[in-house]
Interface confidence: low
């Protein structure tokens, strides 16, 4: 016989099959141009001393075999003997160490038997209802094909799966989708209604992130306020990673999970915008404010859970950086100008009330004045912080204040509201005998004291009511009480306490009367 | 459950148009094959045009040239614009979507009266 043709006689060796577990095995079989073919085999084992021989049987039942030699390929024509346009019956029969070993058959007709792509190129990745769905363009001329797939997580073997028929230009498959573990597919494709058609080779590996991203588990530190009025947000704790299978281990397109800072700042309410989306790794620098910080996780399928933390208020307070003046036509604040062409954000709310309650003001952009001072002023019957009560005022500014980030704060102190200075007026002033010459003057705090830093000073004055001679004493803010001593028995004496603050003279109390009882003795 | 609604079918005099129209549920349209088919009375059903997913499309031989077959993804419609109607094209026309396992349209509609008058 000729090494071209298929050759119609007894194989030169007996025809025992081992029933061994090696052997010839995944043998393919198809057309590669109009008038050629080609089959080829995988073989298990062994391969010294192995020869192969392709074993064809025609529909007539005539049997022939062509001789491959070590080769596991083998190319023939039309003209070699074997029927091309009709169904033949193909297996490979291996000759080894004195025994036979066999594939299983393939039944196919030749000429409609091409050799089948697996999806070339991108192979699009969606979600649907709860499903996943890769879409493919049909390798050129392959249109009509089954698809397989095959799916693996990082702790699972291969699974392996069907796509149903194909008919289109564009080929899809619905695979399984899973809620918390990244999975690695594989497609493969074989000719559609052609009897016995061998399958393509595994498509690359396609990744895929579960469908819902890891929840980020991380930590954040703040620093400390720096001079400039901001604080710098540092993360302690990078999120981890996904694990994935084997073949997305690397490069892995498809499985990132991206993270994403999103910054929500609480105080300053009346500015234009509140919140920023950064990503994790530019960590921001922040002012004083209060900010609620979320680490959002997202893949391909969308955004996960996210973890949110509270960054409280830097409540740090600059007792003499502002100036309030109180006059007939309202108040107005001063501070040191942060520099030209500032907004600011004046925040102020009731002490002890929830942050909730807190009433901004935004300025126009401005610059300072000659004393080199910004201002901020309102009327009277702007109600702000009308009420007499304890009220803590935060200052912020920017020199652009759409973009969150640029904030940075300029003080924060604390101002009582109102008419301080009546409302400050300590009552229930009470006198008591001490000594002979000496009485403890007592009164109740101060409306002031309850506003840190807004109290400077009481002062105490005693008049004496025959000589008209008055005397004051000044008192530290923390004390209500005094002692007042070198006074004389018998003379009348009133006593008034008045609360001061650095920019107001309090009210007097009312006269409180008292005088020495003169000592007789026996 | 995949709905199917034909409409559009009438009485029409030889060398006039139609254009039927089918509104398609309960199936992910623009993944699927479409298609149109018809049944004269004691003939089997022949299928007369099919669009795929990608828009390629396939006629009957005998109304190549006459009928489009065409589709709206966005609004789950698909539409077979007739002209040059002939006798013979008096039928039942009915339209089908999706895929069975066999690459046979699965599912059908009720059907349209088409009537060519000579």
């Known amino acids: 016989c000729r090494t071209s043709e298929c050759c119609f006689q007894d194989p030169p060796y007996p025809d025992a099959d081992s029933g061994s577990a090696s052997g010839p095995r995944d043998l393919r079989c198809y057309r590669i141009s109009s008038d050629r073919y080609e089959c080829s085999w995988q073989y298990e084992g062994p391969t010294a001393g192995v020869s192969h021989f392709l074993r064809c049987c025609l529909s007539s039942g005539r049997c022939c075999y062509f001789a491959a030699g070590s080769a596991t390929r083998l190319q023939f024509s039309d003209q070699a003997g074997v029927s091309v346009l009709y169904t033949v019956t193909l297996w490979v029969e291996s000759w080894a160490r004195n025994q036979t070993e066999k594939s299983p058959e393939v039944t196919l007709q030749l000429y409609n038997s091409v050799k089948y792509e697996p999806p070339l190129g991108d192979i699009k990745v969606s979600k649907l209802a709860g499903q996943l769905r890769m879409e493919w363009e049909t390798p050129d001329n392959q249109v009509g094909a089954e698809v397989q797939f095959r799916h693996r997580t990082p702790s699972s073997p291969w699974k392996l799966g069907d796509c149903g028929p194909q008919d289109d230009d564009t080929e899809s498959c619905l695979c399984p989708l899973e809620m918390n573990v990244a999975q690695e597919f594989q497609l493969r494709r074989r000719q559609l209604g052609s009897q016995g058609s061998s399958w393509s080779k595994w498509s690359s590996p396609v990744c895929v992130p579960p469908e819902n991203p890891p929840q980020p588990q991380v930590r954040f530190s703040v620093e400390q306020l720096g001079q400039d009025g901001r604080r710098r947000l540092t993360l302690k704790e990078q999120p981890t990673q996904l694990e994935l299978p084997e073949g997305c281990q690397g490069l892995a397109p498809g499985t990132e999970v991206t993270y994403r800072l999103q910054l929500h700042m609480l105080s300053c309410p009346c500015k234009a915008k509140a919140t920023r989306t950064l990503h994790l790794g530019k960590m921001p620098y922040l002012s004083g404010a209060a900010y609620n910080v979320a680490v959002i996780s997202s893949n391909q399928f969308g955004p996960g859970l996210n973890q949110t933390w509270h960054i409280p208020a830097d409540t740090h307070t600059e007792p003499v950086a502002l100036n309030i003046s109180v006059g007939t036509n309202g108040t107005t604040m001063y501070w040191p100008a942060r520099a030209q062409s500032m907004t600011y954000c004046i925040e102020w709310q009731p002490v002890g009330q929830d942050g909730g309650l807190a009433t901004c003001s935004l300025t126009a952009p401005q610059d300072p004045d000659p004393a080199g001072m910004a201002t901020y002023s309102w009327s009277r019957e702007s109600g702000a912080m009308g009420q007499e009560k304890c009220y803590y005022i935060t200052i912020f500014a920017s020199a652009h204040p759409e973009k969150l980030t640029l904030w940075s704060t300029v003080l924060s102190t604390y101002h009582f509201g109102g008419n301080a200075s009546a409302a400050g007026t300590p009552h229930h002033v009470s006198v008591k005998n001490h000594s002979l010459d000496s009485v403890s003057v007592d009164w109740a705090p101060s409306l002031l004291s309850t506003c840190p830093g807004v109290l400077k000073e009481y002062v105490v004055r005693c008049r004496d009511e025959d000589s008209k001679q008055v005397s004051e004493h000044p008192v530290q803010p923390t004390e209500t009480q005094v002692t007042l001593s070198g006074l004389r028995a018998g003379v009348a004496y009133t006593v008034q306490v008045r609360a001061d603050t650095a920019w107001l003279r309090g009210v007097w109390s009312q006269p409180q009367r008292f005088s020495i009882e003169v000592q007789v003795s026996d | 459950e995949v709905q199917l609604v034909e409409s559009g079918g009438g009485l029409v005099q030889a060398g006039g148009s139609l254009r039927l129209s089918c509104a398609v549920s309960?199936?992910?349209?623009?993944?699927?094959?479409v298609a149109w088919s018809r049944q004269a009375p004691g003939s089997q059903r022949e299928l007369v045009a099919r669009?795929?997913?990608?828009?390629?499309?396939n006629y009957a031989d005998s109304v190549k040239g006459r009928f489009t077959i065409s589709r709206d993804n966005d609004k789950n419609m698909v539409y077979l614009q007739m002209n040059s109607l002939k006798p013979e094209d008096t039928a039942v026309y009915y339209c089908?979507?999706?895929?069975?396992?066999?690459?046979?349209?699965?599912?059908w509609g009720q059907g349209t009266q088409v009537t060519v008058s000579s």
């Open positions: 669009i795929t997913n990608s828009a390629r499309t």
């Open positions: 309960g199936i992910a349209f623009r993944y699927n094959s």
């Open positions: 089908g979507a999706g895929r069975s396992m066999t690459g046979d349209v699965a599912y």
